[in-house]
Interface confidence: low
């Protein structure tokens, strides 16, 4: 004869207020003859939750038909869950006895606890932009979850980050908890198209974590590099000078030309192109009127990027009958 086992496969069952909870209990043998009862708690003060033979339990229904002779499933459903229903529930087999039934075997118990899903994580980046090679902080917050156990991970472009600190509040018992995590991320020059992701896993999400994202494009400033060149061919008494502003982000840029220290107001031709990494290139052309008798001309391309200090690059045009090579230097 096979020994009776009382199987309650859940250690913990998370339920939501107002919903129905299913407490599983199956037996492995029909013997010994006798009823299965459900209790909350253990010892003399335990509370009877369901007795198929007697009593009135309006919120409890059975999953299977207990009147069938070969029934081995004694699972129950409790409707309209309230906070007062939390506790550990045991299905208990009784053996027929006289004058009353005798407790024979108890299941290991299922703890019923209230669960609440965490809110969608909100990720906030730094207030000001930072240049590559520097570290920026991102915060992630999620609220309103229960129980307290929660796992939070950070990713940058799919790669898990390890430099972060996480706090769950409050530390004591509460109906709901909040999590806040701060991650430190080192910016790379190619991070304009990068994302940081905060991922929150919680029992109530049943294996489907919540994610919050932030774009590093909001946190990064890639400063431009400048190059000023003179086109080798001159058209009549005009020379074409090009200022190439490369690999900058964000797009916000002011470019001015100066001729021998005087800012030029006239229109110049320019083009803006986007690189694959999300940074931009800006090319500006400046036509200089020259004559063979004219003194040397010093041209300056000055760029103010994203409200930062201006950077400039100079080009000295040495113009003779036979146009000489140009030389170039930079000033901060």
């Amino acid at each position: 004869e096979e020994e009776l086992q009382m199987i309650q496969p859940e250690k913990l069952l998370l339920v939501t207020v107002g919903k129905t909870a299913t407490l599983h209990c199956t037996v492995t043998s029909l013997l010994p003859v006798g009823p299965v009862l459900w209790f909350r708690g253990v010892g003399p003060g335990r509370e009877l939750i369901y007795n198929q033979k007697e009593g009135h339990f309006p919120r409890v229904t059975t999953v299977s038909d207990l009147t069938k002779r070969n029934n081995m499933d004694f699972s129950i459903r409790i409707s309209s869950i309230t906070p007062a229903d939390v506790g550990t529930y045991y299905c208990v087999k009784f053996r027929k006895g006289s004058p009353e039934n005798v407790e024979f075997k108890s299941g290991p118990g299922t703890e019923m606890a209230l669960g609440a899903k965490p809110s969608a994580p909100v990720v906030l980046g730094p207030a000001a932009r930072t240049t590559p090679e520097h570290t920026v902080s991102f915060t992630c917050e999620s609220h309103g979850f229960s129980p307290r156990d929660i796992t939070l991970k950070w990713f940058k472009n799919g790669n898990e980050l390890s430099d972060f600190q996480t706090n769950v509040d409050p530390t004591g018992q509460s109906v709901a908890y909040s999590i806040r995590s701060t991650a430190r991320v080192v910016l790379d020059p190619w991070d304009v198209r990068s994302q940081v992701i905060c991922e929150v896993a919680h029992v109530t999400l049943q294996g489907d974590p919540l994610r919050g994202t932030a774009n590093l494009s909001e946190a990064i400033r890639v400063p431009p590099t400048l190059e000023v060149t003179q086109q080798p061919m001159r058209v009549g008494n005009q020379v074409n000078v090009t200022c190439q502003v490369r690999k900058f982000y964000p797009q916000s840029l002011q470019l001015t030309w100066s001729e021998n220290g005087n800012v030029c107001q006239r229109e110049t031709a320019s083009t803006l192109t986007e690189n694959k990494d999300g940074t931009y290139n800006w090319t500006s052309w400046f036509l200089v009127n020259i004559s063979d008798q004219r003194d040397d001309v010093v041209l300056t391309c000055q760029v103010k990027h994203d409200g930062q200090l201006a950077v400039s690059k100079r080009l000295a045009l040495e113009v003779t009958v036979h146009q000489k090579d140009q030389s170039s230097d930079a000033t901060p």
């Epitope: 096979e2 496969p9 859940e10 250690k11 913990l12 069952l13 492995t28 129980p147 896993a201």
Partner: antibody, heavy 126, light 113 residues
């Protein structure tokens, strides 16, 4: 990396108690249940019970009920297993092991053990 | 308690050959509510703790070579090593985690022929 590090070997006299520690690192300590499994020399594996480090809830195998106590210290991410009234047949390697999923789902709450401690040899001899 | 019985107790297989270990439970480990078999397989090498290979009877743990596979349902389960390697020499255990007390098989020792 994720690991469980146990305390060192113990030699005890019959009737005494032993307390073995298991320090967790590399993961959220309170999110995974810790189980204890023992292995007598040259023998198989025997499950002793589990503990939830968050709630402190425990479940012990009937065989060890009354002799085993599992506790935890969340400030140091450490779980302890104390076995009392030791006898010679308690001589074994005692392992702590983490259940493989961070959370109980609504369908299962016992799981396989994915991370094991290195083991603690407990010798009971007069 | 659920009794787990493994066969054979020991097994000698040539390198590159298939090794098959059986595990039988005294009652079904298939839980109808989620249609999962609550069975795991572990590998234990001398002086080391066990290492999880398979859970839910057939799901390979991450990092476990794909020459290890698990099959079966209900009360009969099998661990197969498709092409035995020298590093696979160990004792293998099955374990049920349907209902406490969680129980292990007595172990199967795999050696090279």
């Amino acid at each position: 990396q994720v690991q469980l590090v146990q305390s060192g070997a113990e030699v005890k006299k019959p009737g005494a108690s032993v307390k073995v520690s298991c320090k967790a690192s590399g993961y959220t300590f309170t999110s995974y249940d810790i189980n204890w499994v023992r292995q007598a020399p040259g023998q198989g594996l025997e499950w002793m019970g589990w503990m939830n480090p968050n709630s402190g809830n425990t479940g012990y195998a009937q065989k060890f009920q009354g002799r085993v106590t599992m506790t935890r210290d969340t400030s140091t991410s450490t779980v302890y297993m104390e076995l009392s009234s030791l006898r010679s047949e308690d001589t074994a390697v005692y392992y702590c092991a983490r259940e493989s999923y961070a959370y109980c789902s609504s369908t299962s709450c016992y799981d396989a053990f994915d991370i094991w401690g290195q083991g603690t040899m407990v010798t009971v001899s007069s | 308690d659920i009794v787990m019985t493994q066969s054979p107790d020991s097994l000698a297989v040539s390198l590159g050959e298939r090794a098959t270990i059986n595990c039988k439970s005294s009652q079904s480990l298939l839980y109808s509510s989620n249609n999962k078999n609550y069975l795991a397989w572990y590998q234990q090498k001398p002086g080391q703790p066990p290492k999880l290979l398979i859970y839910w009877a057939s799901i390979r743990e991450s990092g476990v070579p794909d020459r290890f596979s698990g099959s079966g349902s209900g009360t009969d389960f099998t661990l197969t090593i498709s092409s035995l390697q020298a590093e696979d020499v160990a004792v293998y255990y099955c374990q049920q985690y349907l209902s406490p007390p969680l129980t292990f098989g007595q172990g199967t020792k795999v050696e090279i022929k």
